[in-house]
């Protein structure tokens, strides 16, 4: 049975303090993973009892395991059904626990009643607050039954059910006619599926006689133990103030359990704790008497005390649930009450017995639940015990179940029922998933949903390059954790699998289906260097590149340029698509802006190291455009140019700069200063002799302008070839601004 | 054998100036980009500047802008750092080192020149 | 600025052991990390470039691994003359960053 249990406090002086705390002993509860199971839910049911509505409860979770529910403002927001729900998958368990007004007209005398299947239930209605009208039964919210106000027996209404079966399960309440439902008895009834002793899909199996009041699941077979009990049978006390199936849990405060009451998986029910008692659990148990609701007698003999928590307390020499047996009869020794094995092993387990005269090998045998008894093939005597070593053939599914270790000797005999779990290794269902790859590099998220039984405690990733014949690498991971597959071969596919294990001996489970994964292209290595870049205009920047000069083929698909513009916080990036590319032309900059300027080689989709960054200011907008230019060939290496001053100016100009180029000729344009501003006309010398040339001009003032027009001109005659064209020296400094 | 040879460290006084010169030699200089690595005593590693293989691009890291100037003379296979408005801070052992074509670590150091400030 | 984390910054072995020396970046700087060692009065020497890659005349018994942020350099089986100062550097991004160091000693 799962491992869960709802605690009510019902300390009720005042309903603020009152709380509802769901607890799992589940590996894993409430993670909310899919592969580790969805969290603890913990809820009022108001489909059966509906209360008037309040503020919302608040809902606390304490980890993965426990959750509390409170702010109940006032008496009746407690009354009714709650649930809680827990652990994964097939497994998924709802308890449920049912709160009774204790101010209400009428009372159960017990709240939960479990029955087998064809009882006969009986449910008893105590009256509180007398009231002479006829009393309603209802079952799950609907009309069940109506007894006459005169029919109650000794101050109780009685409802008969004969022949019960699963289906009756449910709420029960009575209440007095045309009285407030808060003030009805409400129960709740629980029909095992099987009678009395038996489980099973056909009832066929034989239950393994739970003690202490332990109720057996007629699904599984299995006890469900009352609070402050463990063990397969629930043959063993925990110590006070414990509880859960290993008695692993606490409970809160000073005073332990009282005042508390447990709700465990159907079919127990709820109860008090060990050693408690009464409609609030607040009385201790009457002495001879113990255990959960102090339903259990001692009768202790041999001189053994009662102990309201654990039973009898056997004094040396005696042992047994009455101190009933002498030590002298054989006696098994600390078996543990569960095993756990993985399928196809072939485990051995060790049965310990002492007594008078002592066992021996051939004294202790070990039964599967099939009947078939092995022998021990090998024995361990000590001076206090025997130790019986059986070694059990290859576990198949069927041998989950009750096995039990039996002692025999002239002295008498003990046994000891156990319960085996053969479980299934998990296989994963899915292969696993490709985070991120890089060029010698793949992060794998391992963690699938598989078939068998988790936990998983280690993930095995096998991998090898597709098509490959050679041994599959492995890497063992954290389940939790996403995987780096390193040094790797670049653009390569590899074939991925998951092997998943659970613990324990054999529990690795078979391989999981494959997926191809392919590591990214290799990075480009080179680092481009930044040799230059001039101002083309307030908007234009051309840059220029290098790369080191290195043997074999270019790793690189093109060039990024980034132009980062701190002031404003914006990024420009231009990509050059040719990898022989070592210049650009950058437009539609920000006039008057300071940009720091790298370049990376890029491949694929990866980027190579940057260059060191290079700053450059951008001059600020420039005047407007000369007006008029014309060309007039003077001679045969000179032109003439002229034209009026731009119109509107922001400002004095500082100089002109003329662009020459020869008409369809594919070299760079030249620029020549005119740094006489108050000039409308200059002379270019040194040109060719018949040859056409374009020509344009622009201002600059801080910043450099607009460009003119352009205009055309040929020089004359059949002069010599010249050196190149120069500006009338007219200035004392005239150049070229590159 | 390929190696480079500093020079030019010593003491000089807060505010002071002085200039380191790194003669390469066994490799074809104009090549490949270089770069200045400093390393205060008992400390750490720090880039100071780097150039590339033609000259035409510098850069400096923030503790040394507008004071430091590296530069590289190709006809005569050396590189200069040239170290002005010197402080306390700048107090460490200077190297310079050739940038690897490929991987662009750093594969040749020369020896190190120390370099203190102090009034 | 991308920072370089190096740890331990003090690992004390014995020759012959295996010696395991990690490198973190504050950001991914790809495959683009060297290593290098330096002794005490001498110039620092590269080990291992863009990662896994041995420089030219380092012994087999150094290796390099990782990319993206976490980066290991191991020697395999200590000598005497490997006792000494390691440095990894990024050149993903400038200002180039060196890590502070692990100094490597004799147990």
């Known amino acids: 049975a799962v491992d869960l249990t709802l605690l009510a406090n019902l300390r009720l002086t005042d309903p603020q303090r009152f709380f509802l705390t769901c607890v799992s002993g589940e590996a894993g509860a409430g993670r909310g993973s899919d592969a580790w199971g969805p969290p603890l839910l913990l809820e009022k049911d108001d489909r059966i009892v509906r209360t008037p509505p309040g503020p919302p409860l608040r809902l606390a979770r304490n980890g993965s395991h426990q959750v509390t529910l409170r702010g109940f403002s006032k008496p009746s927001d407690l009354v009714g059904v709650f649930s809680c729900v827990g652990g994964a998958g097939a497994r998924r368990t709802r308890v449920i626990y049912v709160h009774n007004s204790p101010g209400a007209h009428l009372l159960p005398d017990k709240v939960t009643h479990t029955v087998n299947k064809g009882d006969t239930a009986v449910l008893s209605a105590r009256v509180h607050k007398e009231k002479q009208t006829d009393v309603i039964w209802k079952s799950n919210g609907s009309y069940f039954y109506t007894l006459d106000w005169h029919e109650a027996q000794d101050g109780r209404f009685l409802l008969q059910l004969p022949n019960v079966q699963p289906p009756s399960s449910g709420i029960y309440s009575a209440t007095y006619l045309e009285a407030s439902p808060l003030g009805s008895a409400f129960f709740r009834l629980i029909v095992r599926g099987c009678g009395a002793g038996r489980w099973g899909p056909g009832c066929t199996k034989e239950c393994p006689g739970c003690l202490h009041g332990g109720v057996c699941h007629d699904h599984d077979g299995e006890c469900v133990c009352p609070p402050g009990f463990t063990g397969t049978r629930c043959e063993q006390a925990c110590r006070e103030g414990r509880f859960g199936q290993s008695c692993q849990e606490q409970c809160p405060g000073i005073s332990g359990c009282r005042g508390l009451t447990f709700c465990l998986p159907d079919p127990y029910g709820c109860s008090c704790g060990s050693g408690w008692r009464g409609s609030q659990c607040q009385e201790a148990c009457a002495p001879g008497h113990f255990g959960a609701d102090c339903r259990l007698q001692c009768q202790c003999q041999n001189g053994g005390t009662c102990d309201r928590f654990s039973g009898c307390v056997c004094p040396s020499g005696w042992h047994g649930v009455h101190c009933e047996k002498s030590d002298r009869i054989p006696q098994i020794l600390n078996m543990a009450s569960e095993l756990e094995f993985n399928l196809e092993t072939m485990p051995r387990i060790n049965c310990a017995a002492a007594g008078n005269p002592f066992p021996v090998r051939g004294s202790i045998e070990l039964r599967k639940p099939d009947g078939t008894v092995l022998l021990s093939t090998k024995a361990i005597v000590e001076p206090e015990k025997t130790t019986a070593e059986f070694e059990v053939p290859r576990l198949v599914l069927a041998d989950s179940g009750f096995w039990e270790c039996r002692v025999s000797t002239s002295g008498g005999q003990d046994s000891r029922r156990f319960k085996v779990n053969v479980k299934v290794p998990p296989v994963p269902l899915a292969a696993p998933r490709l985070l991120t790859k890089q060029s010698r590099q793949l992060v794998v998220s391992p963690l699938v949903s598989f078939s068998g039984d988790g936990p998983i405690s280690t993930v095995r990733l096998h991998y090898r390059p597709q098509d490959s014949t050679m041994d599959w690498s492995t890497i063992v991971v954290d389940p939790s954790e996403n995987v780096t597959l390193m040094n790797l071969r670049p653009k390569t596919g590899y074939s991925v699998r998951v092997q998943l294990s659970r613990p324990g001996e054999g529990g690795e489970g078979a391989w999981g289906p494959p997926t191809l994964m392919t590591t990214d292209c290799p990075e480009p290595l080179l680092q481009p260097w930044l040799e230059g870049w001039h101002v083309e205009g307030t908007d234009r920047l051309r840059v220029s590149w290098s790369l080191p000069l290195v043997p074999g083929p270019l790793v690189g698909d093109g060039f990024l340029l980034r132009l980062w513009d701190g002031t404003r916080g914006q990024e420009r990036r231009e990509n050059v698509s040719s990898p022989q590319a070592r210049t650009a032309l950058l437009t539609g900059l920000t006039p008057g802006t300071h940009y720091q300027l790298d370049v990376q080689l890029y491949h694929c989709t990866l980027l190579g190291p940057a260059s060191p960054p290079a700053h450059v200011l951008l001059p600020p907008s420039g005047p407007p455009a000369p007006r008029h230019l014309h060309a007039q060939a003077l001679s045969d290496s000179e032109i003439q140019l002229t034209w009026k001053h731009p119109e509107a100016l922001p400002g004095p100009i500082s100089k002109y700069v003329v662009e020459v180029q020869v008409a369809g000729g594919a070299g760079d344009p030249l620029w020549i200063d005119v740094d006489r501003p108050e000039e409308t006309s200059t002379i270019i010398r040194g040109l060719n002799a018949s040859t056409r040339y374009l020509f344009r001009m622009r201002a600059s003032i801080q910043g450099l302008g607009d460009w003119s027009n352009t205009v055309e001109e040929s020089t004359l005659g059949n002069g010599l070839q010249a050196e190149g064209p120069v500006q009338e020296s007219r200035a004392a400094e005239e150049g070229l601004d590159q | 054998e390929v190696q480079l040879l500093e020079s030019g460290g010593g003491l000089v006084q807060p505010g002071g100036s002085l200039r380191l010169s790194c003669a390469a030699s066994?490799?074809?200089?104009?090549?490949?980009?270089m770069i200045w690595v400093r390393q205060a005593p008992g400390k750490g590693l720090e880039w100071v500047s780097v150039?590339?293989?033609?000259?035409?691009?510098?850069s400096y890291a923030d503790s040394v802008k507008g004071r430091f100037t590296i530069s590289r003379d190709n006809s005569k296979n050396t590189l200069y750092l040239q170290m002005n408005s010197l402080r306390a801070e700048d107090t460490a052992v200077y190297y310079c080192?050739?940038?690897?074509?490929?991987?662009?670590?750093?594969?040749?150091w020369g020896q190190g020149k120390m370099v203190t400030v102090s009034s | 600025d991308i920072q370089m984390t190096q740890s331990p910054a003090t690992l004390s072995l014995s020759p012959g052991e295996r010696a395991t020396l990690s490198c973190r970046a504050s950001q991914s700087v790809s495959i683009y990390l060297a290593w290098y060692q330096q002794k005490p009065g001498q110039a620092p020497r590269l080990l291992i470039y863009d990662a896994s890659n041995r420089a030219t005349d380092i012994p087999a018994r150094f290796s390099g691994s990782g990319s993206g942020t976490d980066f290991t350099l191991t020697i395999s089986s200590l000598e005497p003359e490997d006792f000494a100062v390691y440095y990894c550097q990024q050149r993903s991004s400038w200002p180039i960053t060196f890590g502070l160091g692990t100094r490597l000693e004799i147990k």
């Open positions: 066994g490799f074809t200089f104009s090549q490949y980009p």
């Open positions: 150039i590339s293989p033609s000259g035409g691009h510098t």
């Open positions: 080192a050739r940038i690897q074509y490929y991987g662009g670590a750093f594969d040749i």
